[in-house]
């Protein structure tokens, strides 16, 4: 089975890799612009220059192409406790990231927002904060697990989800409880 | 057992308004992150909106930030979406949901969902 070609990846693919069919004359095969560019003017005629220029401060273009317009530069979100980890320059976009001790969360595909690692305070650190992945905490006896944060037992109450993990500590809030009845 | 029961949908004309509710059970609700997912007719889910355990932090996706916003009542279990100037656009089935921070899915439970119509 042939993969489907949308009419731009159809018109590149006869043209050797670098460049691009020229859009007014298919005969015509122009070089694409470098990376930091992007296309001002198609090349007149074969063997002839194409017309490149570089992007504006604010735009890149990170990869050869045939774009008419640079692509804008990414702004960190910083409602998302994001910073900069490197700024655009033309031919890369901006990188952001989280603060040190800080995970990302992905809401989507290309948007995250920074959360700080869990300490571990009251437990152990099973795994390490990561990158896109908090740490992973075991807790002391006498804690339980919530929100990956090691919580203590007392603030757990029956029928809750943290029963079982701190069954003996309930069972012995309810053998107290029984005993002070006559 | 977990349970999320969404409630609210509807049919509103664009530029209406709509508020959703989601009855929450099975653990503790002010413990936790919850929000909004939502999908549309032949598209994936998608995050609308999310709120912290006290409700002091939020998240709203860039398409609905102005327009909905979320809230909790933890002393009724109970999660809010309301949703102003709808547009076609919003038209999707939301779902409650439990948010599982940290890496991985992003949610661990999900409502059986409502349907919002936005159309004149």
């Known amino acids: 089975l042939v993969p489907h070609l949308g009419d731009r990846e159809k018109r590149d693919s006869v043209c050797p890799q670098g460049k691009y069919i020229h859009p007014q004359n298919n005969s015509i095969c122009c070089t694409k612009c470098h990376k930091g560019t992007y296309l001002y003017n198609d090349c007149p005629g074969p063997g002839q220059d194409t017309d490149c220029r570089e992007c504006e401060s604010g735009s890149f273009t990170a990869s050869e192409n045939h774009l008419r317009h640079c692509l804008s530069c990414s702004k960190c979100r910083k409602e998302m406790g994001q910073v900069e980890i490197s700024s655009c320059t033309v031919d890369r976009d901006t990188v952001c990231g989280c603060r040190k001790n800080q995970y990302r969360h992905y809401w989507s595909e290309n948007l995250f927002q920074c959360f700080n690692c869990s300490l571990c305070l009251n437990g152990t650190v099973h795994l390490s904060c990561q990158e896109k992945q908090n740490t992973v905490c075991t807790c002391h006896a006498g804690f339980f697990l919530r929100e990956n944060e090691c919580v203590s037992c007392s603030n757990c109450k029956k029928s809750l989800e943290c029963t079982k993990l701190c069954l003996p500590q309930i069972e012995n809030v309810k053998g107290t409880e029984d005993s002070g009845t006559t | 057992e977990v349970q999320l029961l969404e409630s609210g949908g509807g049919l509103v004309q664009p530029g209406g308004s709509l508020r959703l509710s989601c009855a929450a059970s099975?653990?503790?609700?002010?413990?936790?992150?919850m929000g909004w997912v939502r999908q549309a007719p032949g598209k994936g889910l998608g995050w609308v909106s999310a709120?912290?355990?006290?409700?002091?932090?939020?998240y709203y996706a860039d398409s609905v930030r102005g327009r909905f916003t979320i809230s909790r009542d933890n002393s009724k279990n109970t999660l809010y979406l309301q949703m102003n100037s709808l547009r076609a656009e919003d038209t999707a089935v939301y779902y409650c949901?439990?948010?599982?921070?940290?890496?991985?899915?992003?949610?661990?439970?999900r409502g059986q969902g409502t349907l919002v119509t936005v159309s004149s």
């Open positions: 709120i912290s355990g006290s409700g002091g932090s939020t």
């Open positions: 099975g653990f503790t609700f002010g413990w936790y992150w």
């Open positions: 949901a439990k948010v599982k921070l940290g890496g991985g899915p992003n949610f661990d439970y």
